[in-house]
Amino acid sequence: LLVSQGVLLKCQKGSCSNATQYEDTGDLKVNNGTRRNISNKDLCASRSADQTVLCQSEWLKYQGKCYWFSNEMKSWSDSYVYCLERKSHLLIIHDQLEMAFIQKNLRQLNYVWIGLNFTSLKMTWTWVDGSPIDSKIFFIKGPAKENSCAAIKESKIFSETCSSVFKWICQY
């Protein structure tokens, strides 16, 4: 990661005045607490069209999104932070086709954290982007109570204690 030389620059001929520097001091809006909702700000920076999406090394591409499958195990909140620090989020599953893609690439039978947890504030299962789960598409096996987070196993979604340690999937 060492950097080679960056040479000093000059402007030959003519008088050059220093350009004014622009500085944006606006704060990144973040919710209080562990849970931080994904913002739409800079969304255009992510991708302009599905066809042009190119994922980083180690990330798999599917339907215009990039997916990363962990090898280690963490709690739901640690997994959540892990994804966030990589400008991504825990997996949000939109349909059964996406679930099939995920299952095909998991290659193991254990639980895997996804971006869904039970929020005591709303008293409902909510995806990390703030949207509610579509009960017509997905059914969650297990208790819907405080400190419950969702994990997938063999194309099914299970309610598990958030402090449990499982593998996880990041998505952007």
Epitope: L1, D24, K41, A45, S46, Q56, S57, E58, V81, K87
Partner: antibody, heavy 116, light 110 residues
Framework: SLEESGGDLVQPEGSLTLTCTAS?????????ICWVRQAPGKGLEWIGC???????TYYASWAKGRFTISKASSTTVTLQMTTLTAADTATYFC?????????????WGPGTLVTV | ALVMTQTPSSVSAAVGGTVTIKCQAS??????LAWYQQKPGQPPKLLIY???NLESGVPSRFRGSGSGTKFTLTISDLECADAATYYC????????????FGGGTEVVVK
Amino acid sequence: SLEESGGDLVQPEGSLTLTCTASGFSFSSSYCICWVRQAPGKGLEWIGCIYSDSGNTYYASWAKGRFTISKASSTTVTLQMTTLTAADTATYFCARDSGTTSWRYNIWGPGTLVTV
Amino acid sequence: ALVMTQTPSSVSAAVGGTVTIKCQASQSIGNDLAWYQQKPGQPPKLLIYAASNLESGVPSRFRGSGSGTKFTLTISDLECADAATYYCQGTYRGSSISWPFGGGTEVVVK
């Protein structure tokens, strides 16, 4: 804005701690703060970063062990440097990421000079 | 480890002309690339983020393109004030995140 301080003349094998101070915002929110250095007449070199809420740190491979980034308070992040050599002589900058779905280091301090 | 290679190390062009700077990543980084302008005695100034997004306040004469491993910064209608060193910075989103810089390109405006 950001401002670095603590730059000084230090003896070889010595240690030094630099401080990055924020004004107009605090590190209590989720920010990625990075340290970058620039030797005289040379290019920019990434040292490492810290996420202000989790405290998780990431370093360039050459910086691991000798450089430590930590959050000292809600407005300060520090860079501790040990076993300094002449090769560490540089201007040290701190920068803040403002992006959400992409990295956007648009807030930089003016830099502080370290001479070994 | 992610390595960013920037070319050329120096380029010269006349006022009103166009300059193209290239940056290559050692592995695919999607669109996770930024471009900076730096003048002597000043910190770097962000020009482009996410490969092609123009930072607020930066003239549209600066254009970023590319994805994967190959990226380009194009400066058109060159002005004297564009004389500076330009750096690319990639981001690797792997298990250990890294943000290496390219070696820098000197732009001399004649």
